[in-house]
Interface confidence: low
């Protein structure tokens, strides 16, 4: 079972960006996190990126004002990944 983030939160929300913060998981098997952004109701990710396992923050930029976004963070290990931790936020 790949460990899943439990404390994902939003910080520094503007009309075109959303900041994410979480506590990096303490496991030597984790190689990083994948951030996926979906415009609510669309199903297709409009943005994806990776950060390393020691990182606990990320700022998603280039968003459109007034739109709901589902933002997921997925824990990555070699050969697998966790279920997504997802939050919804409007810019």
């Amino acid at each position: 079972e790949v460990p899943q983030l439990t404390d994902l939160s939003f910080v520094d929300i503007t009309d075109s960006s959303i900041g994410l913060r979480w506590t990096p998981l303490n496991s030597s098997t984790i190689i990083g996190y994948r951030i996926t952004v979906v415009a609510a109701g669309e199903g297709i990710p409009i943005f994806e990126d990776f950060v390393d396992s020691s990182v606990g923050y990320y700022t998603v930029t280039g968003l459109e004002p007034g739109i709901d976004y589902d933002i997921s963070v997925i824990t990555l290990i070699n050969g697998g990944e966790s279920a997504p931790t997802t939050l919804t936020q409007q810019t």
Partner: antibody, heavy 116, light 110 residues
Amino acid sequence: EVQLLESGGGLVQPGGSLRLSCAASGFTFSSYAMSWVRQAPGKGLEWVSRISPSGSSTYYADSVKGRFTISRDNSKNTLYLQMNSLRAEDTAVYYCARRMSYFDYWGQGTLVTVSS
Amino acid sequence: QSALTQPASVSGSPGQSITISCSGDSLGIFRSGMVSWYQQHPGKAPKLMIYLPTSRPSGVSNRFSGSKSGNTASLTISGLQAEDEADYYCQSWDGRQPVFGGGTKLTVLG
């Protein structure tokens, strides 16, 4: 209409270099991660490399790490793959593709042949 | 050796339904739902048919459908037509990178 057009393929000797380009149009290029995927003759698909929308992060398959470099110029809507120290096993059709978790648009491919 | 296993070939007659399976290992390769399917005709670029793992891009026939259960994803093609004859690849994630199945050659008989 989304279009991806690769160029730069050709015949090169082992140990040589090539630079592939992929010209993108019909979408906001700077908003999307981009990838290179290759297919050796008669074989299946193999992911090669990907680059984040801004170009700040890149990842490579183990088979090309240290030899290939992916880059992009968002002002020119163009994706690149610099291939050095080419080997016979790099012979393949190289496709650029949009996104990185899955690939919703593909170019027509450009053939790279590594042979002496 | 791919981390995703597909049958090398399947066949069916026009009008029939066929299913192509794609099995992952036990490491949670499908956990986040990132499973996609591509169709490739000879000499052509792959085309996305199914993603995430049951959604169909616009322009793809509703004869194509995807499903996922545990460590196995499936592509079903109903009402098989001659133009469906092609290679089909599944694709998911293995840690940081995309991984493809070895491909399945679909032959439409007759």
